[in-house]
C-alpha cells in the first residue's frame, strides 16, 4: 500500500506564438482545479482502461478574473497535493492522465459550470520511495508543470512497495526466512499480506494482496467449497485426484453482491457491477461522494455531497457507464462519409478522407457538379466522389472541350470506310452492304435486307450518319 | 436547458444588409458546431449555412455563397449571420440550430424559434 | 446536389393510426439521414438521427427505417400532439439537403 503524490506548479500559456485566451473573464469568473487518473502498466489496453491505480480531485483553485487585454498568465492554482491512495503494489510502470477544468461562477442557471481546459496524457516509470519527478507537458497552447512521487506507507517499503517490515521481536535477528529491512537494519520483513478477507485455513499467497486456494476450495477468497459428487455439471476445473470438481453453489448462487449489485460469472470467479454509490469486490463499500473522485475519463460528479446522497457521473462524449468507465467506439457509427477512414484518438475523432471529399467527416464532395460547366452542351453527371460530362455528339474529353472523332471507335460495319462529317460520321459501305453503318446485306436480286434503302439512295453509295 | 434565440430579423430593401445573431444558451457553446436554416413563407426548410465549433470549417449553401457571412464568438456565446446584397428570394424564417457533438451525424439537435427576414421595395 | 424527395406531401389520418412518411435520396447517403417535426407555431424539433436512432425525450411510438436511398418514418399510433408538418434530412454530403415535407392533418 502506499499514496501518490502530485503537485501541479503552474498551469498557463504554453511557450511560442499564439498565446491562449485567458479562460476566465470580468463577466465570468473562473477558477481552476485538476483531477488525475492513474492506471497500471504501459501497454495500449491501459490507455482504454478505467483509472485502476485510482484517481483524485484536487480543492478548486483561488477565484480568478481577467485583467481586460492583458495575456493569459498562470492561473492561481489549488493549495495542497493531489494524493491517489493504491491497496496493492505499485506498479513501476503507470500511465496517467491530469485534467484542468475551469469552474464558472457566473449567474449560471442551476449551479456553476463546469468545462474542461486541458487533458495531457503520459506513461512513466517510477519507483515508489524515490525523489520527486519533475515533468512538463503540453495541451494546445497551454503548458502544465508538476512533480509528482509514490511513496510507500508503513509498514511496506521497497519499489513496489511489497516489502512489510516490523520492529524486531528480537535484538539478534529476525525471524526463520525474513531478511532485515535495508536500510532499516533495526526492522526485519513481515510475512506476506494475502487480500483482505482471504481465508487464512484454505488460503495462501505468494504475491501480496493474492489469494489462491487450497484444493477443496474455491471463490474469490477461498471460502466456496468444492464438492466432488458429480461430474454433470460443466463448472470448474478438472482435477487429476478426483477427475473433476463441480462447485456446489456457483460463483453467482445466493448472489455475493451486496447492496443490490449484479453478479455475472468470470473465467475464475465472479464479477459484481454496483449501483451507484457502492463499490468493491461485491459492493459492500459505501459512501461514495464526489470527493472520492469516482468518475473516470474526464466525467464530471454532480451531486454526491455527503455519503447518503448519491452521486452522478456526466461522461464526456465517448465515454459510458455509471462511473465514466466504458469507453465508446464512436468509429463504429461510421462517422466518415464517403469511404473515409475513421480515427479515434481518443480526445478527438478523426477521418482520413478519400481523394475527391474533403471536411471533418469528408462530407464536402469537391468533385461535384456545383459551379463546373461541361463545354460544347455536354451535361454533367456526379456521384461517388467523382463528376463526369456526358458530351454531346462529336465532343469527348473530361469537360467536352475536345472534338471527338467520330471514327476512332470504327463504326463502319463489314469493312466499311469511315468518313468525319460536320454532323457526325459517314459510312462509305463496301460493295454487297449497306445503312448508315454498313450494317445490312445487300441481296444479290438487287432487294436488300430490311429495313429497305432510302428512296433515291442505290446501295454502296456512302450514307451519312446523324 | 438548451436555448437558441435569434436576433436582428427585420424588413429591408433588396440590395440592402442585415445582421442576424442567435444567442446560446444551456450548453458549451465552444464544443458545438451552428447551423443557419431557413424558411420562406408556406415552403420548406433550406440549410444556409454552417460553421464547426471552432469556427475552423464554414460551409454554405450556393444561393448565398458570396453574400452571406457566418460567424461566430465563443467567448460571447454568440453565433452571426452577416447578409449582404439581399434579393426578394431571401425572405424567410431564419434559425439557428445546433449541431451535434463532433458532428458525427451533422443533424441539428436543438432550434431557436426564428427571425423573420423580409426583403422588399 | 443529393434531392430528397418526400411522400406523401399531405395526409390525413386519426388519433390512434399508423402513419408512416417515406424520404427517398437520389443517391445512398449510408443512414445519415434525420427527421423533423415543425408545429404550426414554428417550432423545430428533432426526432430522429441516422436513421433510427431517437432523439432523447422524443417519444417511442415514432421510429425511424431504412438505408441507402430509402428511409421511413412511422408514428405507431398517432397523439393529438402529433399532427404536424415532417422532413427528413441528409447529412451524409454538402449541401445537407431536406425533404419538401409532409403535412399529418386530422382526418
Known amino acids: 500500500a502506499g499514496v501518490f503524490e502530485l503537485q501541479i506548479h503552474s498551469f498557463g500559456p504554453g511557450p511560442g506564438p499564439g498565446a491562449p485566451r485567458s479562460p476566465c473573464s470580468a463577466r465570468l469568473p473562473c477558477r481552476l482545479f485538476f483531477r488525475v487518473c492513474l492506471k497500471p502498466g504501459l501497454s495500449e489496453e491501459a490507455a482504454e482502461s478505467p483509472c485502476a491505480l485510482g484517481a483524485a480531485l484536487s480543492a478548486r483553485g483561488p477565484v480568478y478574473t481577467e485583467q481586460p487585454g492583458a495575456p493569459a498568465p498562470d492561473l492561481p492554482l489549488p493549495d495542497g497535493l493531489l494524493q491517489v491512495p493504491f491497496r496493492d503494489a505499485w506498479p513501476g510502470t503507470f500511465s496517467f492522465i491530469i485534467e484542468t477544468w475551469r469552474e464558472e461562477l457566473g449567474d449560471q442557471i442551476g449551479g456553476p459550470a463546469w468545462s474542461l481546459l486541458a487533458r495531457v496524457a503520459g506513461r512513466r516509470r517510477l519507483a515508489a520511495g524515490g525523489p520527486w519527478a519533475r515533468d512538463i507537458q503540453r495541451a494546445g497552447a497551454w503548458e502544465l508543470r508538476f512533480s509528482y512521487r509514490a511513496r510507500c506507507e508503513p509498514p511496506a517499503v521497497g519499489t513496489a512497495c511489497t516489502r512489510l517490515c516490523r520492529p524486531r521481536s528480537a535484538p539478534s535477528r529476525c525471524g526463520p526466512g525474513l531478511r532485515p529491512c535495508a536500510p532499516l537494519e533495526d526492522e526485519c520483513e513481515a510475512p506476506l499480506v494475502c487480500r483482505a478477507g482471504c481465508s487464512p485455513e484454505h488460503g495462501f499467497c505468494e504475491q501480496p494482496g493474492e489469494c489462491r486456494c487450497l484444493e477443496g476450495w474455491t471463490g474469490p477468497l477461498c471460502t466456496v467449497p468444492v464438492s466432488t459428487s458429480s461430474c454433470l455439471s460443466p463448472r470448474g476445473p478438472s482435477s487429476a485426484t478426483t477427475g473433476c470438481l463441480v462447485p456446489g453453489p456457483g460463483p453467482c448462487d445466493g448472489n455475493p453482491c451486496a447492496n443490490g449489485g449484479s453478479c455475472s460469472e468470470t473465467p475464475r470467479s465472479f464479477e459484481c457491477t454496483c449501483p451507484r454509490g457502492f463499490y468493491g469486490l461485491r459492493c459492500e463499500v459505501s459512501g461514495v461522494t464526489c470527493a472520492d473522485g469516482p468518475c473516470f475519463n474526464g466525467g464530471l460528479c454532480v451531486g454526491g455531497a455527503d455519503p447518503d446522497s448519491a452521486y452522478i457521473c456526466h461522461c464526456p462524449p465517448g465515454f459510458q457507464g455509471s462511473n465514466c468507465e466504458k469507453r465508446v467506439d464512436r468509429c463504429s457509427l461510421q462517422p466518415c462519409r464517403n469511404g473515409g477512414l475513421c480515427l479515434d484518438l481518443g480526445h478527438a475523432l478523426r477521418c482520413r478522407c478519400r481523394a475527391g471529399f474533403a471536411g471533418p467527416r469528408c462530407e464536402h464532395d469537391l468533385d461535384d457538379c456545383a459551379g463546373r460547366a461541361c463545354a460544347n452542351g455536354g451535361t454533367c453527371v456526379e456521384g461517388g466522389g467523382a463528376h463526369r460530362c456526358s458530351c454531346a455528339l462529336g465532343f469527348g474529353g473530361r469537360d467536352c472541350r475536345e472534338r471527338a472523332d467520330p471514327c476512332a471507335a470504327r463504326p463502319c460495319a463489314h469493312g466499311g470506310r469511315c468518313y468525319a462529317h460536320f454532323s457526325g460520321l459517314v459510312c462509305a459501305c463496301a460493295p454487297g452492304y449497306m445503312g448508315a453503318r454498313c450494317e445490312f446485306p445487300v441481296h444479290p436480286d438487287g432487294a436488300s435486307a430490311l429495313p429497305a434503302a432510302p428512296p433515291g439512295l442505290r446501295p454502296g453509295d456512302p450514307q451519312r450518319y446523324l | 436547458e438548451v436555448q437558441l434565440v435569434e436576433s436582428g430579423g427585420g424588413l429591408v430593401q433588396p440590395g440592402g444588409s442585415l445582421r442576424l445573431s442567435c444567442a446560446a444558451s444551456g450548453f458549451t457553446f465552444s464544443d458545438y458546431g451552428i447551423h443557419w436554416v431557413r424558411q420562406a413563407p408556406g415552403k420548406g426548410l433550406e440549410w444556409v449555412a454552417y460553421i464547426s465549433s471552432g469556427g475552423y470549417t464554414i460551409y454554405y449553401a450556393d444561393t448565398v455563397k458570396g453574400r452571406f457571412t457566418i460567424s461566430r464568438d465563443n467567448a460571447k456565446n454568440s453565433l452571426y449571420l452577416q447578409m449582404n446584397s439581399l434579393r426578394a428570394e431571401d425572405t424567410a424564417v431564419y434559425y439557428c440550430a445546433r449541431g451535434d457533438y463532433e458532428d458525427i451525424f451533422y443533424t441539428m439537435d436543438y432550434w431557436g424559434q426564428g427571425t423573420t427576414v423580409t426583403v422588399s421595395s | 446536389d443529393i434531392q430528397m424527395t418526400q411522400s406523401p406531401s399531405s395526409l390525413s389520418a386519426s388519433v390512434g393510426d399508423r402513419v408512416t412518411i417515406t424520404c427517398r435520396a437520389s443517391r445512398d447517403i449510408t443512414k445519415f439521414l434525420n427527421w423533423y417535426q415543425q408545429k404550426p407555431g414554428g417550432a423545430v424539433k428533432l426526432l430522429i438521427y441516422y436513421t433510427s436512432r431517437l432523439h432523447s425525450g422524443v417519444p417511442s411510438r415514432f421510429s425511424g427505417s431504412g438505408s441507402g436511398t430509402d428511409y421511413t418514418l412511422t408514428i405507431s399510433s398517432l397523439q393529438p400532439e402529433d399532427f404536424a408538418t415532417y422532413y427528413c434530412?441528409?447529412?451524409?454530403?454538402?449541401?445537407?439537403?431536406f425533404g419538401g415535407g409532409t403535412k399529418v392533418e386530422i382526418k
Open positions: 434530412q441528409q447529412g451524409n454530403t454538402l449541401p445537407w439537403t
